[in-house]
C-alpha cells in the first residue's frame, strides 16, 4: 500500500512534474476546468487528489493524479471531499496547480516530506 510519508525524492519528482505542465503556459489547463480550492495547511496530498480527481479527460494532469495517488494513504474517488476543501470556492486547474506548486516547494525547502 502507498506510504503515508512520501520520501523527498518523490516530492521532488512531483514538483518537477507540476513545473513541466505549467512552464510558460498561458493557455487554460484542462480547457479551463474548475476545481475545488483546498486548505494547504495539512493533508495536502489527499486533498489535492480529491480535488483534481474530478477532472477527467485532461491528459496534462494524468501523471500528477497518479503521483498524488501514490502519496495518499487512502483510496480517493471522484466526488469525495474532505473537510480540507475551502467551502464553496472553485478555481481554475492552472491556478490550483500553481498554488500547489508554490506550497510543495515551501515544504521541500523546510524538509517536510510527509
Amino acid at each position: 500500500s502507498p506510504s503515508p510519508v512520501p520520501p523527498s525524492t518523490a516530492l521532488k519528482e512531483l514538483i518537477e512534474e507540476l513545473v513541466n505542465i505549467t512552464q510558460n503556459q498561458k493557455a487554460p489547463l484542462c480547457n479551463g476546468s474548475m476545481v475545488w480550492s483546498i486548505n494547504l495547511t495539512a493533508g495536502v496530498y489527499c486533498a489535492a487528489l480529491e480535488s483534481l480527481i474530478n477532472v477527467s479527460g485532461c491528459s496534462a494532469i494524468e501523471k500528477t493524479q497518479r503521483m498524488l495517488n501514490g502519496f495518499c494513504p487512502h483510496k480517493v474517488s471522484a466526488g469525495q471531499f474532505s473537510s480540507l476543501r475551502v467551502r464553496d470556492t472553485k478555481i481554475e486547474v492552472a491556478q490550483f496547480v500553481k498554488d500547489l506548486l508554490v506550497h510543495l516547494k515551501k515544504l521541500f525547502r523546510e524538509g517536510q516530506f510527509n
Epitope: 513545473v19 512552464q23 510558460n24 498561458k26 516547494k105
Partner: antibody, heavy 126, light 108 residues
Framework: EVQLVESGGGLVKPGGSLRLSCAAS????????MSWVRQAPGKGLEWVGR??????????NYAAPVKGRFTISRDDSKNTLYLQMNSLKTEDTAVYYC?????????????????WGQGTLVTVSS | SYELTQPPSVSVSPGQTARITCSGD??????AYWYQQKSGQAPVLVIY???KRPSGIPERFSGSSSGTMATLTISGAQVEDEADYYC???????????FGGGTKLTVL
C-alpha cells in the same frame, strides 16, 4: 546590487574546449532558472540552453546546434553558472550572455526578475 | 525546429506609434517576451508574459498577443527607443527557448 558577471571567454581553435563561468550576486541564485544566450558578431540573439533550479529538478535543455557539445551546470554553493563548450566550431564564435530565465519565474521565487550579464566573447578560429 | 518570425526593420517618426510583430505557431499557448538591445549593450526586458511591463520600463511600451501573433507597441516613440527588438518564447513543450530574428527600429 543584482548582477551577473561572465568570464572565461577567449580565443580557441576549432575542435577545442572552453568553460565559461557566470557569477551571480544580489539575489537567491539557487531559486533561479538560468539561461545562456549567444550573439554572433552582427547577428541576432540565439538561445543556447537553460538549467532549472535544483528544486525544480535541475534539468537542462539545449538548442539543437549545441546539443551534445555544450553542457550547462550550476554550483549553488558558489552562486555560479557554467557553460562547458566542447568540439567548438567557427560558427560558435559569439558573445555569450548568462541570464535569469523568465520561463521559470512563476513560482514565488523571483517573479518578474530579469538580469543579464555583460557578455563574454568567444572566438573560434584557427 | 521552432521559429519566431519578425520583420527585419520598422521605421517611424518621433512621436508616432511603432508596432513590431512576432509570429509563431506556439504563441496561442506560450507567453511572449520582448527585449530591447542597444548597440554594444546587453539586452533589456521590456515586456514579459505577453503584456506585462517590468518596473522601470516607460509606459509607452506595451505588449499584446492574439492567436499566433504577439505585438510590441511603442506609443509615441522617442529617439532613445532606436534599438534592436527581439521577441522570445518557447516551443510547445515549454522546454526549448527561441528568439525571433530581431527587428531594427529606426526613429527618424
Amino acid at each position: 546590487e543584482v548582477q551577473l558577471v561572465e568570464s572565461g571567454g577567449g580565443l580557441v581553435k576549432p575542435g577545442g574546449s572552453l568553460r565559461l563561468s557566470c557569477a551571480a550576486s544580489g539575489f537567491t541564485f539557487s531559486n533561479a532558472w538560468m539561461s545562456w544566450v549567444r550573439q554572433a558578431p552582427g547577428k541576432g540573439l540565439e538561445w543556447v540552453g537553460r538549467i532549472r533550479s535544483e528544486i525544480d529538478g535541475g534539468t537542462t535543455n539545449y538548442a539543437a546546434p549545441v546539443k551534445g557539445r555544450f553542457t550547462i551546470s550550476r554550483d549553488d554553493s558558489k552562486n555560479t553558472l557554467y557553460l562547458q563548450m566542447n568540439s567548438l566550431k567557427t560558427e560558435d564564435t559569439a558573445v555569450y550572455y548568462c541570464a535569469t530565465d523568465q520561463v521559470g519565474a512563476y513560482y514565488g521565487d523571483y517573479y518578474g526578475m530579469d538580469v543579464w550579464g555583460q557578455g563574454t566573447l568567444v572566438t573560434v578560429s584557427s | 525546429s521552432y521559429e519566431l518570425t519578425q520583420p527585419p526593420s520598422v521605421s517611424v517618426s518621433p512621436g508616432q506609434t511603432a508596432r513590431i510583430t512576432c509570429s509563431g505557431d506556439a504563441l496561442p499557448e506560450k507567453y511572449a517576451y520582448w527585449y530591447q538591445q542597444k548597440s554594444g549593450q546587453a539586452p533589456v526586458l521590456v515586456i514579459y508574459e505577453d503584456s506585462k511591463r517590468p518596473s522601470g520600463i516607460p509606459e509607452r511600451f506595451s505588449g499584446s498577443s492574439s492567436g499566433t501573433m504577439a505585438t510590441l507597441t511603442i506609443s509615441g516613440a522617442q529617439v532613445e527607443d532606436e534599438a534592436d527588438y527581439y521577441c522570445h518564447s518557447t516551443d510547445s513543450s515549454g522546454n526549448h527557448g527561441v528568439f525571433g530574428g530581431g527587428t531594427k527600429l529606426t526613429v527618424l
